[in-house]
Interface confidence: medium
Amino acid sequence: GWVWNQFFVPEEMNTTSHHIGQLRSDLDNGNNSFQYKLLGAGAGSTFIIDERTGDIYAIQKLDREERSLYILRAQVIDIATGRAVEPESEFVIKVSDINDNEPKFLDEPYEAIVPEMSPEGTLVIQVTASDADDPSSGNNARLLYSLLQGQPYFSVEPTTGVIRISSKMDRELQDEYWVIIQAKDMIGQPGALSGTTSVLIKLSDVNDNKPIFKESLYRLTVSESAPTGTSIGTIMAYDNDIGENAEMDYSIEEDDSQTFDIITNHETQEGIVILKKKVDFEHQNHYGIRAKVKNHHVPEQLMKYHTEASTTFIKIQVEDVDEP
């Protein structure tokens, strides 16, 4: 019968011929009366056999990631008779893995959106690298993920590639972050290869800013001839949030005379001071009113940012009109 062990050949061997093993018949007494032959894909080009001894050699550099095993056939012939000594047999040469492939992130580019002020531990995104090396061969394809850029705001779970928030972020200070993740094979041991990817993390807005008046004091004038409903001027607050989180409502906080009103222009986010009652210069020639501004939509959990509404003082001078 045929005698052989499992055949392995390391990939990427640079030698011109690499001895893999021996294939022989147990009838072979070593007197060179048998001839060994190799057949199948790769026979003669990639692998050769010593016809006398049955020793098999790899004569080409192999790449496991291209082809990980070869199925060949062996024959042994009695030189004197030309007849097969053993039935033709199929055998396998496995290409063993070396760590010659770095991890690659295949789903690039990565982009994620996460609400600002999200608590520590919030999941942002999972990045996954793949390594073409053999996952069953040692640690060649066992990956560890680490953060090259993004501290202290982000962290990555070493074995899963899950990116989490590690420190609260304020969109109004910075609205996007570039995080660089490295994947290293060999679980980080010497000889490890690495690959990196960038993740663009954008912060979505939450209503964590209340509107604040641009001025602590506004000065307006109104003619005593102005009819009720007259717009006598505008006031303006600013809100560092965006979109509906920056929509605001103006109102009167204090007007003992009940002479004025404030309406909100929701397109410009301005407050319009309106004359509610006609004024008379001879009766009262100036007024002071206090206005306040609040956001239109504030979720309950964000009320802590909106405890005290911003206020402003409006000085309103009545202009005298000569009476006939």
Epitope: R219, H286, G288, F313, K315
Partner: antibody, heavy 119, light 107 residues
């Protein structure tokens, strides 16, 4: 420090003119409305005139309207009161005063300058 | 114009006593628009109270203001030697007018 200093007072004949100045320092002069208030000898206080922070509006007491002109130079942090057609009853210590941001009361006063109108 | 009448014209008290000064307006004054000032001889007035009851910065808490409508009061809970002066009320709801003053003198 934060202060107002008046100057320009003196003795003038009835019908004469005088220009008072008030130099401001230690605060953002151009942000405040400014007023002149006077006090006749042994009497109470009387408001005279106001000018808005940017000079856009000016208002006067009936007793001085048409004779006095209030003005300001924000680049020099100075308030002025031009007094024409002076009368004996204009004799007083003239104070410049700063209006607060939130009302028309006066939170800062100068030491005053005396104007005497006498023949 | 709104006329403010202060009473009494003179108040003679000793240090440590309580002083109550009155200011009456000829027509209703919004409480937001009444102030009190202190003036010592040869000095400019000094703001004590605004908005009828709010103490100005740096004013000791022995000074307090109250009132609404046409009647307002300045109270000095315990007179200190430096409190003897003339006190003026001022309304600033319609133009600017001052009361004629109340002199607080040492008895």
């Amino acid at each position: 420090q934060v202060q107002l200093v008046e100057s320009g007072g003196g003795v003038v004949q009835p019908g004469g003119s005088l220009r008072l100045s008030c130099a401001a320092s230690g605060f953002s002069f151009s942000s405040y409305d400014m007023d002149w208030v006077r006090q006749a000898p042994g009497k109470g206080l009387e408001w005279v005139a106001v000018i808005w922070y940017d000079g856009s509006n000016k208002y006067y007491a009936d007793s001085v309207r048409g004779r006095f002109t209030i003005s300001r130079d924000n680049s020099k942090n100075t308030l002025f009161l031009q007094m024409n057609s002076l009368r004996v009853e204009d004799t007083a210590v003239y104070y410049c005063a700063r209006e607060t941001g939130e009302g028309w009361y006066f939170d800062l006063w100068g030491q005053g300058t005396l104007v005497t109108v006498s023949s | 114009e709104i006329v403010l009448t202060q009473s009494p014209g003179t108040l003679s008290l000793s240090p440590g006593e309580r002083a109550t000064l009155s200011c009456r307006a000829s027509q209703s004054v919004s409480s937001s628009y009444l102030a009190w000032y202190q003036q010592k001889p040869g000095q400019a007035p000094r703001l004590l109270i605004y908005g009828a009851s709010s103490r100005a910065t740096g004013i000791p808490d022995r000074f307090s203001g109250s009132g609404s409508g046409t009647d307002f009061t300045l109270t000095i809970s315990r007179l200190e030697p430096e409190d003897f002066a003339v006190y003026y009320c001022q309304q600033y709801g319609s133009s600017w007018t001052f009361g004629q003053g109340t002199k607080v003198e040492i008895k």
